[in-house]
Amino acid sequence: GSERTCCPVNWVEHERSCYWFSRSGKAWADADNYCRLEDAHLVVVTSWEEQKFVQHHIGPVNTWMGLHDQNGPWKWVDGTDYETGFKNWRPEQPDDWYGHGLGGGEDCAHFTDDGRWNDDVCQRPYRWVCETELDKASQEPPLL
């Protein structure tokens, strides 16, 4: 495929990535799938500047990101290393809280209303952000 040189319509460019901000809510898995169908992934936050950029757009609304620990350790959906990477958890988070009464703990990370991160029940219908890299090869066949 050819390299994507500009963001698709309704996507927003920042530092060689394109972002799409939902205006409705989905469970984490459905949001993850939505992004994959767009040849993208749930947003992976790798720096303070990227954190701020996302906050510029989402405002004070719970919003899923591409970080989960459904299989044990915390993992970013694109393989970015969690342990050495950027983090912006609220104090005392993540806590894998079981007291919500919905069964299980909390395995999916989201931006809270102040932008800092919290782990929550993955079934909650939060907004989400998709991200795709500009220099990633697109899936479209090359022009002849």
């Epitope: 927003v12 920042h14 510029h56 757009h57 405002g59 004070p60 609304v61 209303d113 102040d114 800092r116």
Partner: antibody, heavy 116, light 107 residues
Framework: QVQLVESGGGVVQPGRSLRLSCVAS????????MHWVRQAPGKGLEWVTI????????YYADSVKGRFTISRDNSKNTLYLQMNSLRAEDTAVYFC?????????WGQGTLVTVSS | DIQMTQSPSSLSASVGDRVTITCRTS??????LNWYQQKPGKAPKLQIF???SLESGVPSRFSGNRSGTEFTLTISSLQPEDFATYYC?????????FGQGTRLEIK
């Protein structure tokens, strides 16, 4: 580095019009909402108007609604404020600022004086 | 509309002092509360955004907190360059409101 430079201020008579510009550089202008904030001499900050990154949404303070119009030209990295039917109470330094939920970069301001 | 009350309107303090400025909003809302520093003849500078987050380049002696409808900006140990006017600002829905400002002066 991020820079915002306002221009277009000056002395104008009541009832007349003026257009302010804010030229942005050092960031992807089309990816950010922008707003105008003003400050009357010796007074505090007053929000004026805001525009979304793509220009689709615009909101105004009650004090300027129907008289001021915010717009942007993303191809020119420029934000505008068209001010009509100016009043003495519109006298202020006008700042443009980047962002909707918080203003992380501001211009140096341009002074608008409405006086007969 | 949400009303904001910033206090005190002015404050005299000495280098090394711990000072706190408060902003109260008229209702508990999903909103961003930000703090700006302004020096005479200059543009405002973002210090804290979304109640808690320190803007890049702002010294760690600045901190923000929230308790219900009360937001605070604290400077743990005042430095000479901190003397300025501070404004809180709330973005809620389709409007933005600034507090009246707090002028921080050298005692």
């Amino acid at each position: 580095q991020v820079q915002l430079v306002e221009s277009g201020g000056g002395v104008v008579q009541p009832g007349r019009s003026l257009r302010l510009s804010c030229v942005a550089s050092g960031f992807t202008f089309r990816s950010y909402g922008m707003h105008w904030v003003r400050q009357a001499p010796g007074k505090g900050l007053e929000w004026v108007t805001i525009i979304s990154y793509d220009g689709s949404n615009k909101y105004y303070a009650d004090s300027v609604k129907g008289r001021f119009t915010i717009s942007r030209d993303n191809s020119k990295n420029t934000l505008y404020l068209q001010m009509n039917s100016l009043r003495a109470e519109d006298t202020a330094v006008y700042f443009c600022a980047r962002g909707v939920w918080f203003g992380d970069f501001w211009g140096q301001g341009t002074l608008v004086t409405v006086s007969s | 509309d949400i009303q904001m009350t910033q206090s005190p309107s002015s404050l005299s303090a000495s280098v090394g002092d711990r000072v706190t400025i408060t902003c109260r909003t008229s209702q508990n809302s999903n909103s961003y509360l930000n703090w700006y520093q302004q020096k005479p003849g200059k543009a405002p500078k973002l210090q804290i955004f979304a109640a808690y987050s320190l803007e890049s380049g702002v010294p760690s002696r600045f901190s923000g907190n929230r308790s219900g409808t009360e937001f605070t900006l604290t400077i743990s140990s005042l430095q000479p360059e901190d003397f300025a006017t501070y404004y809180c600002q709330q973005t809620y829905g389709t409007s933005i409101t600034f507090g009246q400002g707090t002028r921080l002066e050298i005692k």
